[in-house]
C-alpha cells in the first residue's frame, strides 16, 4: 500500500501506559497531541485521581485516549468505548468534584463509540469491579 509508511505504529514510550494489553500507538492521539511526550505530561495531571482509586479502569481509559491502540490492519487509532468512559466517569467524576474540578470536556463520553463493532472499533477495557468507592472520612483528595 502507498500509505504503509504513514500507518506504521510506534511503541508506547509512556511508562504508565505500558503493560496494559497493547504496546503500540499512533499519534496524534484523540485529544490532538502530536507527541507522546506532550501526552505524557497531560496524563501526569491525572495521577492524583489514579492514586485515589476511584475506578480500576481509569488508567486504561486514560491511556486509550492519550495513546490509543494502533494496528497495521486499519489506519485509524482505536480508542475507548463509550461504555467504559461512562463507567469511569460515573465513579471518578464525584471524586474530581471533591478536588474542585469538573469532568474534562476532552473526555466527553459521547465522543467515543458506544460499543465495539466492525463499523466503530473501540476498546472495552478490563471489567470494572462494582464495589463501593474507597471509604475516606472525610474525603481528602490527594492525601495518602
Amino acid at each position: 500500500f502507498g500509505d504503509e509508511e504513514e500507518r506504521r505504529c510506534d511503541p508506547i514510550r509512556i511508562s504508565m501506559c505500558q503493560n496494559l494489553g497493547y504496546n503500540v500507538t499512533k499519534m496524534p492521539n484523540l485529544v490532538g497531541h502530536e507527541l507522546q511526550t506532550d501526552a505524557e505530561l497531560q496524563l501526569t495531571t491525572f495521577t492524583p485521581l489514579i492514586q485515589y482509586g476511584c475506578s480500576s479502569q481509569l488508567q486504561f481509559f486514560l491511556c486509550s485516549v492519550y495513546v490509543p491502540m494502533c494496528t497495521e490492519k486499519i489506519n485509524i487509532p482505536i480508542g475507548p468505548c463509550g461504555g467504559m468512559c461512562l463507567s469511569v466517569k460515573r465513579r471518578c467524576e464525584p471524586v474530581l468534584k471533591e478536588f474542585g474540578f469538573a469532568w474534562p470536556e476532552s473526555l466527553n463520553c459521547s465522543k467515543f463509540p458506544p460499543q465495539n463493532d466492525h463499523n466503530h472499533m473501540c476498546m472495552e477495557g478490563p471489567g470494572d469491579e462494582e464495589v463501593p468507592l474507597p471509604h475516606k472520612t472525610p474525603i481528602q483528595p490527594g492525601e495518602e
Epitope: 506532550d38 505530561l41 495531571t45 492524583p48 492514586q51 474542585g100 474540578f101 481528602q140 483528595p141 495518602e144
Partner: antibody
C-alpha cells in the same frame, strides 16, 4: 487540609545563594506538580520553576536557568528551590503552588521574601 | 515563548458594574488558561481554569470565555470584595507557565 508553607527567605548579597523550602501537608507531593512563582515588589507574577516529584521532571524559566535548581524530597513531602548567583532583579516574594488537573494552581503558600542587596 | 498580553493594566469601576478583562495569547494555547485573583499581601487564588470552568467555591458572578487566542474574564456585578488584581496564566506548554501582566481593579 491542604497547606503549603514556604521558608528560607531573607537578605542576601548579589552573587550569593539561598535555599527556599516548601513544606506540604494534606496531600502527597509525589502526584502533583509543584511550582515556584515569584513577585517582585509592586510587579506581577512570574513563573520560576516546576517539578513533578514522582518522575523528577523539572522545568525552568529562561531568566533562572542555570542559576536555580528545583528539587523535592518525597519522604519529607517538601520541595526546594536552590538559588545561586543571585542578582538584584531576583528580589521578590517567592510562592510555591501545586497543580494537577488542567495545570491550574489550586493551592498556594503564603510566600517568603527574598531580598538581594549589598 | 508564548506571551500573554493582558488588558487593561488597570480600571476603575463601581459596585454593581460589569467588568471585563482580556488576555491575548501570542500563539494558540488551546484552552489551558486560568485566571487568578490577588489581594495586597496575599497569595493568588484560582478563579477559572480551562478558560471557562469555574473553580469550586468561586462565586458565579465570575466567568471566563475564549475566542480564538483571546481569553476573557468577566465579573457580572462587581462586589466590594472583588477589588483586587487579576492575572491570566497559560499552561499549554506544561513546562512553561506564562502569566499576564495583571489588571488592577480599583474603586471609582
Amino acid at each position: 487540609e491542604v497547606q503549603l508553607v514556604e521558608s528560607g527567605g531573607g537578605l542576601v548579597q548579589p552573587g550569593g545563594s539561598l535555599r527556599l523550602s516548601c513544606a506540604a501537608s494534606g496531600f502527597n507531593i509525589s502526584y502533583y506538580y509543584i511550582h515556584w512563582v515569584r513577585q517582585a515588589p509592586g510587579k506581577g507574577l512570574e513563573w520560576v520553576a516546576s517539578i513533578y516529584p514522582s518522575s523528577g521532571y523539572t522545568y525552568y524559566a529562561d531568566s533562572v536557568k542555570g542559576r536555580f535548581t528545583i528539587s523535592a524530597d518525597t519522604s519529607k513531602n517538601t520541595a526546594y528551590l536552590q538559588m545561586n548567583s543571585l542578582r538584584a532583579e531576583d528580589t521578590a516574594v517567592y510562592y510555591c503552588a501545586r497543580s494537577s488537573f488542567y495545570w491550574a494552581m489550586d493551592y498556594w503558600g503564603q510566600g517568603t521574601l527574598v531580598t538581594v542587596s549589598s | 515563548d508564548i506571551q500573554m498580553t493582558q488588558s487593561p493594566s488597570s480600571l476603575s469601576a463601581s459596585v454593581g458594574d460589569r467588568v471585563t478583562i482580556t488576555c491575548r495569547a501570542s500563539q494558540s494555547v488551546s484552552s489551558a488558561v486560568a485566571w487568578y485573583q490577588q489581594k495586597p499581601g496575599k497569595a493568588p487564588k484560582l478563579l477559572i481554569y480551562s478558560a471557562s470552568s469555574l473553580y469550586s467555591g468561586v462565586p458565579s458572578r465570575f466567568s471566563g470565555s475564549r475566542s480564538g487566542t483571546d481569553f476573557t474574564l468577566t465579573i457580572s456585578s462587581l462586589q466590594p470584595e472583588d477589588f483586587a488584581t487579576y492575572y491570566c496564566q497559560q499552561s499549554y506548554a506544561a513546562y512553561l507557565f506564562t502569566f499576564g501582566q495583571g489588571t488592577k481593579v480599583e474603586i471609582k
